[in-house]
């Protein structure tokens, strides 16, 4: 056959299906490939042609879509299963061509099991939610396209294994789930389970999100550094280990890039000659605010290294703040030991 | 059916205390919250606040922090609105309301009349 | 807070005109927006849920429309039990909040 260009096996696209239910899969090609879409190459005389690699095998084969109830179907750019079946895993290819023209891009499915709390491999979206923060939503997601707008499907929502009944906090309308006053205790997962008929026979879809309580942008400060502060001098002696640490609090911000770092005599460490190393933890709270720890480490301090600037910086999309180590050199203590116990009549 | 039954019309001095009852009927009580409406005279509606009737907690809306306490018997199906050092500005009818984020049922609504 | 407007304060119509009552948000509320008829001296009663939505007990003549922060009751040939008041209220955020109501009147 002729040349096409192949955009290869798009892993990005790791499509995941629940098995028996249905499943709508648009070709990629149009969505992150070509400039244009599926009606324009439709109108220019160009065809999408669909097949399939089984698991674990090698050989290409045609999509059969002649089976019964047209379990799996084409329309217009959606590859349909109506509804899928376990053996349906593989790769798939959508290719567009025409005599002049041909290009083509393979995605994985994989059509996963689930038990009866909902419990399967699939990766799940995670949705954050602010604590305390007012009435809250989450959607029941990705079941567009699925029935007509009228078709009036019946939606049940569950929290883990349990259809939520109790509505003082949470409650389930339609497509949506609101969170009246979102806590701790909210986390977890929610899964929807969307039923509709079509054709006189009735499908479902099931859609599990994690819900993750966060902190509120009402209550989020500007980093706070909780060390150094002025109460801890590092006191060290020539040739003595001098380690100080930088500890940072930010609040959860969404989006929000936290950032720590030194700067020595106003220099970042890696622009001077001194031998520092900069080791870094972080830790998490459960709304996941930030503690970011660095702690500057000289292994053999001297006596001008004693006389720098050690500032620890942070920045987030609150501000930037930074502050200052108290760094002296100790002072030998004077050696009259002997002197003052004889002075005191020791023997 | 469901019915949220308030207590009957209070006629109260400035600086007393009133206790409203709602009680509840018809459905599983400690799966809605229950909010409290204020009406004054010829007015409009205006939300007082809620309790959570599974934990008890409330939450009462800024105008209603002071002197205002809600409250449940949950073996009674019953939620109260208690008001402290009654003012004139008091008189008004208070309704009790299951939500479900619009509310669905409504108590009949209890008056209460503040006069010295 | 979110401020709910609701206008004319009185409409004065006759029985089987059909009017439109309408209640703004100060600020998008999505479809966040119920309805409630009320008779003098007796406690509110739910019409139109999330904008749109019907009521099941309530006459088909009630209707409602709109999302984000214009929002309109619609009455199909008024009858003599709706002369009443008719409040809005909103479910995006806390605290909720009602209009100031409509009073529909006989003209």
């Known amino acids: 056959s002729e040349r096409c260009d192949d955009w290869g096996l798009d892993t990005m696209r790791q499509i995941q299906v629940f098995e028996d239910e249905p499943a709508r899969i648009k070709c990629p090609l149009f969505e992150h490939f070509l400039k244009f879409n599926y009606s324009t190459a439709h109108s220019a005389g160009l065809t999408l042609i669909w097949y399939w690699t089984r698991q674990d095998r090698d050989l290409e084969e045609p999509i059969n879509f002649r089976l019964p109830e047209n379990r799996i179907s084409k329309e217009k750019d959606v590859l349909w299963f109506r509804p899928t079946l376990l053996n349906d895993t593989g790769n798939y290819t959508c290719m567009l061509r025409n005599t002049t023209y041909c290009s083509k891009v393979a995605f994985p499915l994989e059509v996963v099991q689930k038990d009866s709390c909902f419990n399967s491999p699939m990766k799940l979206p995670v949705h954050k939610l602010y604590i305390e923060y007012g009435i809250q939503r989450i959607t029941c997601p990705n079941v567009d396209g699925y029935f007509p707008s009228s078709v009036k499907p019946t939606i049940t929502w569950y929290m883990g294994c349990y259809k939520i009944q109790n509505f003082n906090n949470v409650i389930p309308e339609g497509m949506n789930l609101s969170f009246l006053i979102a806590l701790i205790s909210n986390n977890g997962n929610y899964t929807c389970v969307v039923t509709y008929p079509e054709n006189g026979r009735t499908f479902h879809l099931t859609r599990t999100l994690t819900v993750k309580v966060v902190g509120s942008p009402k209550n989020a400060v500007p980093p706070v550094i909780h060390s150094p502060n002025d109460h801890v001098v590092y006191e060290k002696e020539p040739g003595e280990e001098l380690l100080i640490p930088c500890t940072v609090y930010f609040s959860f911000l969404m989006d929000s890039r936290n950032e720590v770092w030194w700067t020595i005599d106003g220099k970042k460490p890696d622009d001077i000659t001194i031998d520092v190393t900069i080791n870094e933890s972080i830790s998490h709270s459960r709304t996941e605010d930030e503690t970011r720890t660095q702690i500057l480490s000289i292994k053999k301090v001297t006596s001008e290294d004693l006389k720098r600037s050690y500032v620890c910086h942070a920045r987030s999309a609150k501000g930037e703040v930074a502050k200052a180590a108290k760094v002296k050199q100790k002072v030998p203590a004077p050696r009259y030991t002997v002197e003052l116990a004889c002075g005191f009549g020791a023997t | 059916q469901i019915q949220l039954v308030q207590s009957g019309p209070e006629l109260k001095k400035p600086g007393e205390t009133v206790n409203i009852s709602c009680k509840a009927s018809?459905?599983?009580?400690?799966?809605?919250?229950m909010h409290w409406v204020k009406q004054a005279p010829g007015k409009g509606l205006q939300w007082m606040g809620w309790i959570n009737t599974e934990t008890g907690e409330p939450t009462y809306a800024d105008d209603f922090e002071a002197r205002f306490a809600f409250s449940l018997a949950t073996s009674a199906n019953t939620a109260y609105l208690k008001i402290n050092n009654l003012k004139n500005e008091d008189t008004a009818t208070y309704f009790c309301a299951r939500f479900f984020l619009h509310f669905d049922y409504w108590g009949q609504g209890t008056t209460l009349t503040v006069s010295s | 807070d979110i401020v709910l407007t609701q206008s004319p304060a009185t409409l004065s119509v006759t029985p089987g005109d059909s009017v439109s009552l309408s209640c703004r948000a100060s600020?998008?509320?999505?479809?966040?927006l119920h309805w409630y008829q009320q008779k003098s001296h007796e406690s509110p009663r739910l019409l139109i849920k999330?904008?749109?939505q019907s009521i099941s007990g309530i006459p088909s003549r009630f209707s409602g429309s709109g999302s984000g922060t214009d929002f309109t009751l619609r009455i199909n040939s008024v009858e003599t039990e709706d002369f009443r008041m008719y409040f809005c209220?909103?479910?995006?955020?806390?605290?909720?909040?009602f209009g100031a109501g409509t009073k529909l009147e006989v003209k």
């Open positions: 018809g459905y599983t009580f400690t799966d809605f919250s």
């Open positions: 999330y904008a749109s």
């Open positions: 600020q998008s509320i999505n479809n966040d």
């Open positions: 209220q909103q479910s995006n955020n806390w605290p909720l909040t």
